[in-house]
């Protein structure tokens, strides 16, 4: 008996061919011998089956001895053996209909689990193999689970159901809701304007939720909420903002925050959380601010950085176009009795300059000038 696999919601055409290339009498029945459809001369007739409004034929091919059964909007319960009776012969076709659905929503937060559930007809023993957009293969039976979804899991998952050495393929689009970057770091000279950006790694028609930026300043004993905001259909509105610092926030996505001035007391790290409507859990992005200050007090030229720097970062003081006078893996360096000229304070990582501040040292009879 011929086996045909179908997909829930799809259409299937079961073929039935007579040896005579002309329109003759035919009937399609199910395993309970209930008539689905057939012909009476050149007329299509339908029986009392549950397929009544979803089953049809291809009238135009009857004259050529072809009498297909076309079933629209397949259901799991359409799985059955279908019998075509034509010319005193019986052609049997076993139809097995499968469905594959994601557990809840196909929009999941980073770190959440994805469960795919296979709907299959009684008596079938299918195997399922799914391939993620990043090429990871998972196998299973009636359910497949992937824990700790990552950003790279966003995209089309292709799942193949195997039964009776035949296969049917499902494609499921999964969107992992996350920020593009888990963490970012901004390096600024004291007094400069600071821009924080929090681009999302997904696009959806309507985006609604609320968010907050908590900030842990390096100099402070506890963290505090700098700003809270609402997101409605991709429009951002500020709910509450601290007086110091007075952050400004962009009205459109991507989420964008502006700190008017980088000051040592603001250096530290923040955590922006975004709670999306109808989702359990929150999106997170860490943001760090490193602030540099170069000063000259009497005979001491000092360069300092505040904020979360890695121990491998190098802080240097050098006179322009000369070798570094001092270079240390520390957060403050200084030079006593500096020569007159333009001094540079550099924060670098493996030779790459991350932050630079210049200070002009005047001959000893004058006061220093910061350009």
């Amino acid at each position: 008996k011929k086996v045909v696999l179908g997909k829930k919601g799809d259409t299937v055409e079961l073929t039935c061919t007579a040896s005579q290339k002309k329109s003759i009498q035919f009937h399609w029945k199910n395993s309970n011998q209930i008539k689905i459809l057939g012909n009476q001369g050149s007329f299509l007739t339908k029986g009392p089956s549950k397929l009544n409004d979803r089953a049809d034929s291809r009238r135009s091919l009857w004259d050529q001895g072809n009498f297909p059964l076309i079933i629209k909007n397949l259901k799991i319960e359409d799985s059955d053996t279908y019998i075509c009776e034509v010319e005193d012969q019986k052609e049997e076709v076993q139809l097995l209909v499968f469905g594959l659905t994601a557990n809840s929503d196909t929009h999941l937060l980073q770190g959440q689990s994805l469960t795919l559930t296979l709907e299959s007809p009684p008596g079938s023993s299918p195997s399922v193999q799914c391939r993620s957009p990043r090429g990871k293969n998972i196998q299973g039976g009636k359910t497949l689970s992937v824990s700790q979804l990552e950003l790279q899991d966003s995209g089309t998952w292709t799942c193949t159901v195997l039964q009776n050495q035949k296969k049917v393929e499902f494609k499921i689009d999964i969107v992992v809701l996350a920020f593009q970057k888990a963490s970012s770091i901004v390096y600024k000279k004291e007094g400069e304007q600071v821009e924080f950006s929090f681009p999302l790694a997904f696009t959806v028609e309507k985006l609604t939720g609320s968010g907050e930026l908590w900030w842990q300043a390096e100099r402070a004993s506890s963290s505090k909420s700098w700003i809270t905001f609402d997101l409605k259909n991709k429009e951002v509105s500020v709910k509450r903002v601290t007086q110091d610092p007075k952050l400004q926030m962009g009205k459109k996505l991507p989420l964008h925050l502006t700190l008017p001035q980088a000051l040592p007391q603001y250096a530290g790290s923040g955590n922006l959380t975004l709670a999306l409507e109808a989702k359990t859990g929150k999106l997170h992005q860490e943001v760090n601010l490193v602030v540099m200050r170069a000063t000259q007090l009497q005979k001491n030229l000092t360069c300092e950085v505040w904020g979360p720097t890695s121990p491998k970062l190098m802080l240097s003081l050098k006179l322009e176009n000369k070798e570094a006078k001092v270079s240390k893996r520390e957060k403050a360096v200084w030079v006593l009795n500096p020569e007159a000229g333009m001094w540079q304070c550099l924060l670098s990582d493996s030779g790459q300059v991350l932050l630079e501040s210049n200070i002009k040292v005047l001959p000893t009879w004058s006061t220093p000038v910061q350009p």
């Epitope: 055409e13 049809d56 009238r59």
Partner: antibody, heavy 118, light 107 residues
Framework: QVQLVQSGAEVKKPGASVKVSCKAS????????ISWVRQAPGQGLEWMGI????????SYAQKFQGRVTMTRDTSTSTVYMELSSLRSEDTAVYYC???????????WGQGTLVTVSS | DIQMTQSPSSLSASVGDRVTITCRAS??????LNWYQQKPGKAPKLLIY???SLESGVPSRFSGSGSGTDFTLTISSLQPEDFATYYC?????????FGPGTKVDIK
């Protein structure tokens, strides 16, 4: 929903043959028939023929009998339509479409322009 | 072969108008008739199958009626996106045949 993606435009000389492909995705390829329909510039639609789900049976319009061959490759979910002995009046956009019989042609390819010119 | 004719071959209408296109078969095709919409440079789109059944996703302002040899496609309130060419098609017998089309443009 089923997507049908056709091969690119072709320019052929009179007397030559052209083979247009139609790759299906999103549905179960071996479960539905494919019809081919063409449309000459500024003209209406003209049905060329049909290939059944198993690929075992084809039916062609009398006008194209002997010149057209429709085949399907289940391993790549692709249907092919080859038209031979081309003449200038075969210049047209050729469409493949999922044929659900009396339910109509519900999904169409984007079309392939075949230009026959000496 | 069954010949399909359509009338009018073209018509001008305004947004909000009720538009009726007729299709006639040279012999009875019972209810084996489909309607398609085609926009310039695009593939046709199925609107109505078996004379009066609305294809999934097609706006309810489209409706079809008729059986035997005479059929009608009605757009109850023409929308800007409805300006296109409309074709009828019979699936009663091989060869499948289409009507010559009715072009609906802006008045």
């Amino acid at each position: 929903q089923v997507q049908l993606v056709q091969s690119g435009a072709e320019v052929k000389k009179p007397g030559a043959s052209v083979k247009v492909s139609c790759k299906a995705s999103g549905g179960t390829f071996s479960n539905y028939a494919i019809s081919w329909v063409r449309q000459a510039p500024g003209q209406g639609l003209e049905w060329m023929g049909i290939i059944d789900p198993s690929g075992g049976s084809t039916s062609y319009a009398q006008k194209f009998q002997g010149r057209v061959t429709m085949t399907r490759d289940t391993s790549t979910s692709t249907v092919y339509m080859e038209l031979s002995s081309l003449r200038s009046e075969d210049t047209a956009v050729y469409y493949c479409a999922r044929d659900l019989g009396d339910y109509g042609l519900d999904s169409w390819g984007q079309g392939t322009l075949v230009t026959v010119s000496s | 072969d069954i010949q399909m004719t359509q009338s009018p071959s073209s018509l001008s209408a305004s947004v909000g108008d009720r538009v009726t296109i007729t299709c006639r078969a040279s012999q009875t095709i019972r209810s084996y008739l489909n309607w398609y919409q085609q926009k310039p440079g695009k593939a046709p789109k199925l609107l109505i199958y078996k004379a009066s059944s609305l294809e999934s996703g097609v706006p309810s302002r489209f409706s079809g009626s008729g059986s035997g040899t005479d059929f009608t496609l009605t757009i109850s309130s023409l929308q800007p996106e409805d300006f296109a060419t409309y074709y009828c098609q019979q699936t009663y017998t091989i060869p499948i045949t289409f009507g010559p089309g009715t072009k609906v443009d802006i008045k």
